[in-house]
């Protein structure tokens, strides 16, 4: 995997330095490299029943390097680990395992989900939506005049999209029936959406209940709607910033 692999030479007596190949500083016929040239890492490679010393520019997959004063040495990570910081802490697992707090697991613990891109266990993220925006003007075929019964809609934004195992988002559009003071459209008002409207109480038997927009009637798990509105969120961010105690590096 890495350059500078020092290999043993034939017809060499044990512990003879001359004629070592690649990055070896000292080597033997039987054991290969015994020590490496500066900055190279010494690793033991298993070949059949014996271990051969090799010198590498960096430690191979499944090993981590320690720079001792007299030798740079590669040490094996745990069996299920591809890259590690040391024996205790894995930083990348072998295929089929998920990394969680330095350990390699077959399955992620409860409350976490597998990210198949990073192969790590990550927190489940649920959908978060904003508060509803105000209802739109009561309209019919895009007009706010010349009719009695129309519809009004309201929308809310998705603040946080859910992860694979997270709760799905609830509908983000709602439409309901509404009534307006019947008035004739003025000249030039035809087809225009007005900003103001008078609203009558619904007639007997006429529903004023909100129905989700057909576009947003996806199958969804319910989530609490006790969400902060945008202003509250902004306010909180500003307060958090003001509270921050930050120390910058002195160069």
């Amino acid at each position: 995997q890495n350059a500078s692999r020092g290999r043993r030479q034939r017809r060499m007596h044990p512990n003879v330095s001359q004629g070592c190949q690649g990055g070896c500083a000292t080597c033997s016929d039987y054991n290969g490299c015994l020590s490496c040239k500066p900055r190279l890492f010494f690793a033991l490679e298993r070949i059949g029943m014996k271990q051969i010393g090799v010198c590498l520019s960096s430690c191979p997959s499944g090993y981590y390097g320690t720079r001792y004063p007299d030798i740079n040495k590669c040490t094996k990570c745990k069996a299920d680990c591809d890259t590690c910081f040391n024996k205790n802490f894995c930083t990348k697992c072998k295929s089929g395992f998920y990394l969680h707090l330095g350990k390699c697991l077959d399955n992620c613990p409860e409350g976490l989900e597998a990210n198949n891109h990073t192969m790590e266990c990550v927190s489940i993220v649920h959908c978060e939506v904003s508060e509803w925006n105000p209802w739109s003007p009561c309209t019919k075929k895009g007009k706010t005049c010349g009719f009695k019964r129309g519809t009004e809609t309201r929308v809310r934004e998705i603040i946080q999209h859910p992860s694979a195992k997270g709760n799905l988002c609830p509908p983000t559009n709602e439409t309901r029936k509404c009534t307006v003071q019947r008035k004739k459209c003025q000249k030039g008002e035809r087809g225009k959406k007005g900003r103001e409207r008078k609203r009558k109480k619904p007639n007997k038997g006429e529903s004023k209940e909100a129905i989700p927009d057909s576009k947003s009637l996806e199958s969804s798990k319910e989530i609490p709607e006790q969400r902060e509105n945008k202003q509250q969120q902004k306010k909180r961010k500003v307060q958090d910033k003001q509270k921050s105690v930050s120390v910058s590096t002195v160069h």
Partner: antibody, heavy 116, light 107 residues
């Protein structure tokens, strides 16, 4: 549960000797390099010495070279620090630690006071 | 030896504050940096390894970042139990060296 228990600390006069021990349990002692890290009163952490897993190599900070000797007995899961020619500046809490690039496991420490 | 310079040496903050401690290495140490927390009369406890990876059992309000020579430990919202002394350590090569520590005190 990983445990490292230091012993052997105490008050000693300058120039005298002291031997610290560290009994390990709860992990494979023979797989780990072991170290001593010290902390003078009100000061920071200072690495003292490390012995590799099989006891074949030892490393010391310059200020203790030639005075301190680190050894281990893997059959007894015990680490030792022989401290000779002690000086006032060696006064500190001495921690035994499993050293694998980071210091993953620590003992509770033993106080060494060098004073006349 | 690689010198590790930590700043500040002490810091006063309140519960709920966001706190940042920095560590500067005298040469490139890649991401071979460890952070420890030490409470009075106790031994140090490993918090973060490989500059940014949380040790098992460490709350997620702790985070580490940086690579090369500049590193940061951040506590997003201080809790009463976080008031302690924090040390960085380079694990790039022997001899292992520590920063001088940052004492985090209640304001």
């Amino acid at each position: 549960e990983v445990q490292l228990v230091e012993s052997g600390g105490g008050v000693v006069q300058p120039g005298r000797s002291l031997r610290l021990s560290c009994a390990a349990s709860g992990f494979t002692f023979s797989d780990y390099d072991m170290a001593w890290v010290r902390q003078a009163p009100g000061k920071g952490l200072e690495w003292v010495a490390t012995i590799i897993y099989d006891g074949s190599r030892t490393y010391y900070r310059d200020s203790v070279k030639g005075r301190f000797t680190l050894s281990r007995d893997n059959s007894k899961n015990t680490l030792y620090l022989q401290m000779n020619s002690l000086r006032a500046e060696d006064t500190a809490v001495y921690y035994c630690a499993a050293h694998d690039r980071s210091f993953d496991y620590w003992g509770q420490g033993t106080m060494v006071t060098v004073s006349s | 030896d690689i010198q590790m310079t930590q700043s500040p040496s002490s810091l006063s903050a309140s519960v709920g504050d966001r706190v940042t401690i920095t560590c500067l290495a005298s040469e490139d140490i890649s991401n071979d940096l460890v952070w420890y927390q030490q409470k009075p009369g106790k031994s140090p406890k490993l918090l973060i390894y490989a500059a940014s990876r949380l040790q098992d059992g460490v709350p997620s309000r702790f985070s580490g970042s940086g690579s090369g020579t500049d590193f940061t430990l951040t506590i997003s919202s201080l809790q009463p139990e976080d008031f302690a002394t924090y040390f960085c350590q380079q694990s790039y090569k022997y001899l292992p060296t520590f920063g001088q520590g940052t004492k985090l005190e209640i304001k």
